[in-house]
């Protein structure tokens, strides 16, 4: 069998055996290593020799095999974008940011850049749940049945009404969407103006 | 300006090694530029020995590859050449030189130096 | 290892006259990967030319370079009393880096 071409070698179709670790280089019609994550390219290559790969300095980085001739600046979350940081800057990877809580991303270009306050759920609803925390605005879902939530609010959750024999009372009023169930002692009637309390 | 010389030794016994250090003044060994060993028998045409870079990363002469070693001291801004097991078919002069950017000819060369082979 | 033949050995003309060197490759190499060498008694060489036609800092213009797939040429438009002297040309198309055996240009 042919022995394994190592870089430089000549490439007349302008492709290169190793994709993610090589690339074709058109000035010199040949394939060359690219660098490693954490590095850049210190010396280009040549049909003599390879690419000569260098780390990357502090606060940059290069985060896939690549042929750059320099290392990208290290960035920090930007508080008054919204965002805060989740993992450090390395050699290898970027700052790792995040909306912070109560706010989503509203603008994405293959990052989020710009996060915004979530929007609020009227009472009688909740947000719907997200995979991803901080990706979208909320989208706000009829509390189901037996619960209610009773505030504007962009994260409160619907609870479930308050079952009043568990606590030895009798149901002076039933919960709805927006309110819970109104207990009293079954032994007292319970006044008009007191609805909405619980009478012990 | 840039100059680069060579020093060593001018007389090496057979099967012994042949050391050389080239000494670089006015540039940094350090900016990417490769460097070469470059050797002219008496009376005879050039042969290329070999490259290296401040990485430490070399290229050699497949001829020479078995008998050579260069490596390169940053803090001193030199680097060196090693060729063991001499004869008499190495002397030669012997010429460092700087490796011309991207491209792989040679733009400043040392003067030389001489090294004879012999008991 | 790509060979560089380069003739005439020895090339015999007065001041003032046109020199052409030749240096053949044993294979095609790009026009691209061809440099040519002055060098004078007890000295090392210089570098002339780069990329077969593309003179080095400080080379007069009386020295020009051509050539493509095996044959390459040095032109010495009008030559110097200092421009008797010996060139090599080199090729880096494919390691290892090999030089033609040298043309000497000397006074008629």
């Known amino acids: 069998s042919q022995p394994q071409a190592v870089p430089p070698y000549a490439s007349e179709n302008q492709t290169c055996r190793d994709q993610e670790k090589e690339y074709y280089e058109p000035q010199h019609r040949i394939c060359c290593s690219r660098c490693p994550p954490g590095t850049y390219v210190s010396a280009k290559c040549s049909r003599i020799r390879d690419t000569v790969c260098a780390t990357c300095a502090e606060n940059s980085y290069n985060e896939h095999w690549n042929y750059l001739t320099i290392c990208q600046l290290c960035r920090p979350c930007d508080p008054v974008m919204g965002l805060e940081e989740i993992a450090p800057c390395t050699s290898k990877r970027k700052t790792q940011c995040r909306c912070q809580p109560g706010m989503f991303c509203a603008a994405w270009a293959l990052e989020c850049t710009h996060c915004e306050l979530l929007s609020d759920c009227p009472p009688g609803t909740e947000a719907e749940l997200k995979d991803e925390v901080g990706k979208g605005n909320n989208h706000c879902v009829p509390c189901k049945a037996g619960h209610f939530q009773n505030t504007s609010s962009p994260s409160a959750r619907c609870q479930p009404h308050t079952r009043c024999e568990n606590q030895g009372l009798v149901e002076a009023a039933p919960g709805t969407a927006q309110s819970d169930t109104t207990c009293k002692n079954p032994l007292e009637p319970l006044p008009p103006e007191m609805s909405g309390t619980m009478l012990m | 300006q840039v100059q680069v010389q060579e020093s060593g030794p001018g007389l090496v016994k057979p099967s012994d090694t042949l050391s050389l250090t080239c000494a670089v003044s006015?540039?940094?060994?350090?900016?990417?530029?490769?460097w070469g060993w470059i050797r002219q028998p008496p009376g005879k045409g050039l042969e290329w020995i070999g490259y290296?870079?401040?990485?430490?990363?070399?290229y050699y002469n497949p001829s020479l590859k078995s008998r050579v070693t260069m490596s390169v001291d940053t803090s001193k801004n030199q680097f060196s050449l090693k060729l063991n097991s001499v004869t008499a078919v190495d002397t030669a002069v012997y010429y460092c030189a700087r490796n011309f950017g991207d491209v792989d000819a040679f733009d400043i060369w040392g003067q030389g130096t001489m090294v004879t082979v012999s008991s | 290892e790509i060979v560089l033949t380069q003739s005439p050995g020895t090339l015999s003309l007065s001041p003032g006259e046109r020199a052409t060197l030749s240096c053949r490759a044993s294979?095609?190499?790009?026009?691209?990967?061809l440099a040519w060498y002055q060098q004078k008694p007890g000295q090392a060489p210089r570098l002339l030319i780069y990329?077969?036609?593309s003179r080095a800092t400080g080379i007069p213009d009386r020295f020009s370079g051509s050539g493509s797939g095996t044959d390459f040429t040095l032109n010495i438009s009008r030559l110097e009393p200092e421009d008797f002297v010996v060139y090599y040309c080199?090729?880096?198309?494919?390691?290892?880096?090999?030089f033609g055996g040298g043309t000497k240009v000397e006074i008629k």
């Open positions: 990329g077969a036609s």
């Open positions: 290296i870079h401040y990485s430490g990363n070399t």
């Open positions: 080199q090729q880096y198309y494919l390691s290892p880096l090999t």
């Open positions: 006015g540039y940094s060994i350090s900016n990417s530029i490769w």
């Open positions: 294979q095609s190499i790009s026009s691209s990967y």
